[in-house]
Amino acid sequence: FNISGCSTKKLLWTYSTRSEEEFVLFCDLPEPQKSHFCHRNRLSPKQVPEHLPFMGSNDLSDVQWYQQPSNGDPLEDIRKSYPHIIQDKCTLHFLTPGVNNSGSYICRPKMIKSPYDVACCVKMILEVKPQTNASCEYSASHKQDLLLGSTGSISCPSLSCQSDAQSPAVTWYKNGKLLSVERSNRIVVDEVYDYHQGTYVCDYTQSDTVSSWTVRAVVQVRTIVGDTKLKPDILDPVEDTLEVELGKPLTISCKARFGFERVFNPVIKWYIKDSDLEWEVSVPEAKSIKSTLKDEIIERNIILEKVTQRDLRRKFVCFVQNSIGNTTQSVQLKEKRG
């Protein structure tokens, strides 16, 4: 087919010789076709991954990728000739860096749905260069980890040595979807969840007097977990006194939040203090009432068949412990008046 009508985009991949890194090309088809094929939905920052807009069935791999040999030979089907390049939906993944990846890549719809579609194609001129700038020793890695439950940030490797003030406008993608609100060289994550994991792409434009290029870098982001550095905290009971009716049954609940520990041995128990004596009470088994990747809430109840006068003189103590330390909360019973 005739590629002279294809829209053209120039991209630059500057790779570090010290690291394994990947690269991607998106099939950015011109507008009305995009809706049929690889439309990247805009993503609001509040959206949770379960509610991400997924590509429709007619998007899947309805594009064909070719490479244009520099010697003028016919276009080559990427899938047949290049084992280190993988097509995933409308994205081309380069698994290994190297100047031999330089060249022209063309994508177009597989199914021609209208006469207009014949000219619907994108030509991407990719230039691949090894990184020569040694002045930036601590440039961001192409593999970045975010600690679950904490704050974190994802840096654009090609811009990480520039201050925010001098950084150009950056376009970010996550798993091929545009992150429309992100424009700086760093994405700040207020609280890390497991859905922040994925493949992030950052683009910015570099111009000289002759032409302009899109400089692109790919970052693989993992969400990782680490042991808590905090002892458990007791969520309930909050008050240290509890109004009760004598002669009536009573259940006091102790709920505690335990931070993540790789080897998890939580302790939650009730004991009673009566003047100088104290003893552990045999109570129903503890149960987990909420478990997340970051922490777990465990509940254990003490049950009194009926509240007696003697119980009003006692302190009921909930004791919780993890490998870091322990916390207690005591409750004094008080007779309800009126």
């Epitope: 600690l147 969400t223 990782i224 977990v225 790789r262 080897v263």
Partner: antibody, heavy 124, light 107 residues
Framework: QVQLQESGPGLVKPSETLSLTCTVS????????WSWIRQPPGKGLEWIGY???????NYNPSLKSRVTISVDTSKNQFSLKLSSVTAADTAVYYC??????????????????WGQGTTVTVSS | AIQLTQSPSSLSASVGDRVTITCRAS??????LAWYQQKPGKAPKFLIY???SLESGVPSRFSGSGSGTDFTLTISSLQPEDFATYYC?????????FGQGTRLEIK
């Protein structure tokens, strides 16, 4: 790129204590677990134990009575001490970053970065 | 301790072949399994975690599957650089244990 480098004596006498240090460069020791693994000549891999950067440890029960793993976050290093060694402790000792990946609503642990290994021979 | 048994212990294959290595756990370990590749005189290299998730940068000819007690590592089309020893490893319970290894040789 995070890199790990083991260091320590290559020869230890029986009944003495084997001491190795692993230096982490190109990244922080914080937020990760750090493991020691060994491989006797011509054999498979055996996990010795791990330490979290905060100091929490977990050891292989088969070695627990003889093993101590410690961490020095200021130097970006963690260390292994194995007491009362015998010829059976002769092996290549590796240090590795041991990471818990939170994905698919669960945790998956993996040793994703390894040192190149150091050979320790126990002999008089 | 959970025991992991790999089979076969060694196998010979040619470039371009499809190869499958299995790892059986002595009790259920859900998906808490990783695969490593080790070449002579080198440290192991991590390939797969969570039984089936490929580490970024690992060629897509490697794939993992399985859950519970039976797991497989498949190399769809062997390349010269794939000849090595492969280990499975479980993280489901402590102590962490490895399989005895499968040595993959050139036929």
């Amino acid at each position: 790129q995070v890199q790990l480098q083991e260091s320590g004596p290559g020869l230890v006498k029986p009944s003495e204590t084997l001491s190795l240090t692993c230096t982490v460069s190109g990244g922080s020791i914080n937020n990760y677990y750090w493991s020691w693994i060994r491989q006797p000549p011509g054999k498979g891999l055996e996990w010795i134990g791990y330490i979290f950067y905060s100091g929490t440890t977990n050891y292989n029960p088969s070695l627990k009575s003889r093993v101590t793993i410690s961490v020095d976050t200021s130097k970006n290093q963690f260390s292994l001490k194995l007491s009362s060694v015998t010829a059976a402790d002769t092996a290549v000792y590796y240090c590795a970053r041991d990471v818990g990946i939170a994905a698919r609503n669960s945790y998956y642990y993996v040793m994703d970065v390894w040192g190149q290994g150091t050979t320790v021979t126990v002999s008089s | 301790a959970i025991q992991l048994t790999q089979s076969p212990s060694s196998l010979s294959a040619s470039v371009g072949d499809r190869v499958t290595i299995t790892c059986r756990a002595s009790q259920g370990i859900s998906s808490a399994l990783a695969w490593y590749q080790q070449k002579p005189g080198k440290a192991p290299k991590f390939l797969i975690y969570g039984a089936s998730s490929l580490e970024s940068g690992v060629p897509s000819r490697f794939s993992g599957s399985g859950s519970g007690t039976d797991f497989t590592l498949t190399i769809s089309s062997l390349q010269p650089e794939d000849f090595a020893t492969y280990y499975c490893q479980q993280f489901n319970s402590y102590p962490i244990t490895f399989g005895q290894g499968t040595r993959l040789e050139i036929k």
